[in-house]
Each structure stands twice: as C-alpha cells, then as structure tokens.
Amino acid sequence: EPPTACREKQYLINSQCCSLCQPGQKLVSDCTEFTETECLPCGESEFLDTWNRETHCHQHKYCDPNLGLRVQQKGTSETDTICTCEEGWHCTSEACESCVLHRSCSPGFGVKQIATGVSDTICEPCPVGFFSNVSSAFEKCHPWTSCETKDLVVQQAGTNKTDVVCGPQDRLR
C-alpha cells in the first residue's frame, strides 16, 4: 500500500517517499522506484538554507553600498549574506534593506545607549544636577560642576542645557 506520510527529511511524490535535498543543494530530479533523489550544489552567490525540494537556489542578498550597506557576513551555499550599515548608520529592520542616520541627542538630552548597526541611539532627558550643551550621538549628560569642592560658590544655577557658573566667595572684611 502506498505511503500517505513520509519520514523527516523526505517528501511524498507519485505515491513514493523521496529524500529531500540537503541545505546547499537543489533538486534536479525526484526519486523513482529504482533511483535516489538527484540533487546539485547551489552555484556561486546562491544558497538554500533548509532540507528542500526546490528546483532553484535563492540568490544571496546584495548589500548595496549606495544605500550605506556593507557585508557583515558573507553568504555560503547554506546561508544568505548578512548586511549591516556603515558606521554612523543603522538598519531600518531586521532584514537590513536600508539604513538610517543615527539619531543625535539634542542639548538637554544625553545618550542613554549608543547606536549599533541594528539599533538607533537612545536619548534620555538630563535630570536635575546634569546637563548636555551639545547635539551628539555619543555624549552622556554631564554632572554640574561642584563649586564647593573648588572652594567656590554658585553664581549662576545650572540647567539641563548649561553647567553651573562658579565664582569666588564673598570675603568678609
């Protein structure tokens, strides 16, 4: 009696269980009663990443330098090429089909987490006692200068965008 289901890494065709082609290979011809499944390795710049019965291999992804993309990991016959973005840019998605310039944190905000090839800069507001006077993708909020430790007094209060201004203490004559 012909099978209705096949084992793992097999497929049913013409009432027969044939072996799937292994990753990195494509199907040339199905098995018969007398012959095994015929598979061929994928060509240069092609891949198949699963046990399969595909008659065509997939093309490796192209990391388009015009979009700021570069190869992070070269593809093999069993894996696709992995793209990433050039320095200062990050991928728009997991598939990394295009890039976006890293966000800068505006004055009053500091960098909580520096951007990577796949994630954007994370900014945070500078809390009381801290400031940032620049727009930057790297700078954290800086603590206000401690006037006391310099034997000075606060002449002008700090804000989230400016440091305190220290000055000499009034001397009592």
Partner: antibody, heavy 117, light 108 residues
Framework: QSVEESGGRLVTPGTPLTLTCTVS????????IHWVRQAPGKGLEYIGI?????NIVYATWALGRFTISKTSTTVDLKITSPTTEDTATYFC??????????????WGPGTLVTVSS | DVVMTQTPASVSEPVGGTVTMKCQAS??????LAWYQQKPGRPPKLLIY???TLASGVSSRFSGSGSGTEFTLTISDLECADAATYYC??????????FGGGTEVVVK
Amino acid sequence: QSVEESGGRLVTPGTPLTLTCTVSGFSLSAYAIHWVRQAPGKGLEYIGIIDAGGNIVYATWALGRFTISKTSTTVDLKITSPTTEDTATYFCGRGLSSYSNSAMDLWGPGTLVTVSS
Amino acid sequence: DVVMTQTPASVSEPVGGTVTMKCQASQNIYTYLAWYQQKPGRPPKLLIYQASTLASGVSSRFSGSGSGTEFTLTISDLECADAATYYCQSTAGNAYNAFGGGTEVVVK
C-alpha cells in the same frame, strides 16, 4: 488613497493649536507620516515624522515646539506655543515606506496657520 | 544636522532646452535623496527618490543622479508646464530629512 490636513486657523501667540492629518485608503501601520511647513513666499521646512511603529522624531529646530501623535486613521501635530514665526501652510505627507528614510509620495493640500495678535 | 544647499536659486531656459540644478549635502547621505516639484498654491509633487529612481507617473524627461554629497536633477526638452520651484530633500531618516532652499525654473 489620500491625506488631508485640517485645523489651520488664526490664533494668538501662545495659544496651542492642533492640526490633524486624516488618511484614507491605506494603513498608518504600514506607512510613515511626515510633517512639513512652508511660510508665505518661503521654502519647505521639515518638522518631523511618526513612523509605522509609532517612533517619533523631530527636526532639531522643532524640538519642544511641536508634538506629533497618532490614532488608527489620523496623525496630529500640536504647535505647543505658537509665535508669529509659525505662520505657514502645514503639510502632511505619506512616506514611501514604513521607515523614516523615505521620500513623500502623497501630500495633502495643506492647512494655513496664521499667528497674530 | 544635515544641511542641503541648492544651486542656482533661479534658472531661465527656453522651451525645448535643458535645465540642470545641483544639490549638495553637508555630509554623506549615500543615495538617500529626493526631488520635488512645487507650483504656487499647490503641495509638492515627488519626482525622484533614492537619487535616481523616477516616481510613478513622472515623465522620463526628469532624471536624477549623484551619491554621497553631490546630486543633480536634469530636466530635458523643457515644457511650459515645468515652470515651478524644485526642492531636494535628504531622506537619510530620523531628524535628517532636511530640504534644500529650492531652485526656481522659469521657462521662456
């Protein structure tokens, strides 16, 4: 598919004003929406964007002056404390994709905001 | 921030002529650049995106080129209907989607 701005009117300086961009024929979960303005007789000025995922980014000059938010079919632009310099026609535009790095292929006719005392 | 500089501010050419305008970015934006046409009282219309890709329904008389920091928009076989102001825009994403100052095209 269309986008249309509304809410533009004459306001006095300091009076908050909310503009609305109403979209139809496409989903805001698939496209980014940009806000752009144009002062009378001047060029285009980029304000900010809300992408499909709800991430909001403002042009540096616009930080603190505007607030962008969205519902399922509308995107709002709030001018927090208008000054006479904010007198302009405000446009919303649909991005070609869901991301912030996309050009705008669909624009509304614009809504005029006049700030005057 | 990315600053976009357009030249010339204005250009005048006869019908049938060719107009070329330039757009310079203050930093490398690869090919993340769009061109728009705007006529008085109308919203901008997308002509070209990704520096050289023609937007849907746009005449092939419009062409864009360049990458990095230098970009060009060319209008060939100029028609009266091409009289408008043309803007370039960085589409590098985030807060970097700045516009250039515009180039006015006058058709004689």
